[in-house]
């Protein structure tokens, strides 16, 4: 088990949460492991228990404070350690000097709603959740629309290269059911990645007026 390939990946949500995944080929499912966070310039330490998410991977969330509190800054470094129980003692499996603002993954956008819908277009808005005020407007979004008979993977990506929390979808088919998703990413951070996709928003375009081409 010890010689299997290991991987430890963590992301900061920009406010008060560091989410981590630990994987190790050949490790036993009932292995007891935890992540320990040890900041370089703060008085707190934090630990979370790694819980199994698949055959050889475990995940946990380091909750650093209230969801919207700004617990870390761009100058912070947090040493993260994976510790696994071996008999009566804990064994260090991995260590990382984690730079939070180089490893960002925001929460999925929330509160998606249809602002206005017509036969061929639909205006949708959303909000970002637990995003640091440090970003100001330095965020980008990707959106996708699920059309009937297609999969999410086939949906073309629409890119919004600025902090724009709305979109006007065009060239839609009248009287048709669609679903819409959006995700967000800060421009900052060498290892920053996209947030999860938002919960899908279902909407239906208006039917075309009889005898009219709208």
């Amino acid at each position: 088990a010890v010689n299997g390939t290991s991987q430890f990946t963590c992301f900061y949500n920009s406010r008060a949460n560091i989410s981590c995944v630990w994987s190790q080929d050949g490790a036993l499912q009932d292995t007891s492991c935890q992540v320990h966070a040890w900041p370089d310039r703060r008085r707190w330490n934090q630990t979370c228990e790694l819980l199994p998410v698949s055959q050889a991977s475990w995940a946990c969330n380091l909750i650093l404070g209230a969801p919207d509190s700004q617990k870390l800054t761009t100058v912070d470094i947090v040493t993260l350690r994976v510790l696994c129980r071996e008999g009566v003692r804990w064994r260090v499996m991995a260590i990382q000097d984690f730079k939070p603002f180089e490893n960002l993954r925001l929460m999925a956008p929330i509160s998606l709603q249809v602002v206005h819908v017509e036969t061929h277009r639909c205006n949708i808005s959303w909000e970002i959740s637990q995003a640091s005020h440090y970003f100001e407007r330095h965020l980008e979004f990707e959106a996708r629309t699920l059309s009937p008979g297609h999969t999410w993977e086939e949906a073309p990506l629409l890119t919004l290269k600025q902090k724009q929390e709305w979109i006007c979808l065009e060239t839609l088919t009248p009287d048709t059911q669609y679903e819409f998703q959006v995700r967000v990413k800060p421009l900052q951070g060498e290892f920053t990645t996209w947030s999860p996709w938002s919960q899908p928003l279902a909407f239906r375009t208006k039917p075309a007026a009889l005898g009219k081409d709208t």
């Epitope: 390939t5 370089d40 991995a94 260590i95 000097d97």
Partner: nanobody
Framework: QVQLQESGGGLVQAGDSLRLSCVVS????????MGWFRQPPGKEREFVAL????????HYTDSVEGRFTISRDSAKNTVYLQMNSLKPEDTAVYTC????????????????SGQGTQVIVSA
Amino acid sequence: QVQLQESGGGLVQAGDSLRLSCVVSGRDFSGYTMGWFRQPPGKEREFVALITWSTGRVHYTDSVEGRFTISRDSAKNTVYLQMNSLKPEDTAVYTCAAGRVGYTTNLHSYDYSGQGTQVIVSA
């Protein structure tokens, strides 16, 4: 490209000291973790020590704790392994590794590694 070059190995007597060096080049290693592994003749490769580049936090395997010291010199882009009170069982090829994460489990989970330097401790 990224390179890690070990040096400082050699033949010594039991109880002597050696200092291994690992010079890293080819990228900014701040935020990385540097590890030393060793492979004794006819045995599996094993973890020895690691140090986080930014904060200088260290970790050792039990068998070298108190005898070996890992350190880094950011100005020289070099990681050192000071080995005191050497024993015949410390005989091995010592390899330096670098990664965004430092693993005690194995060398091949690191992003980069060197070629190794031979240490022989005679009784």
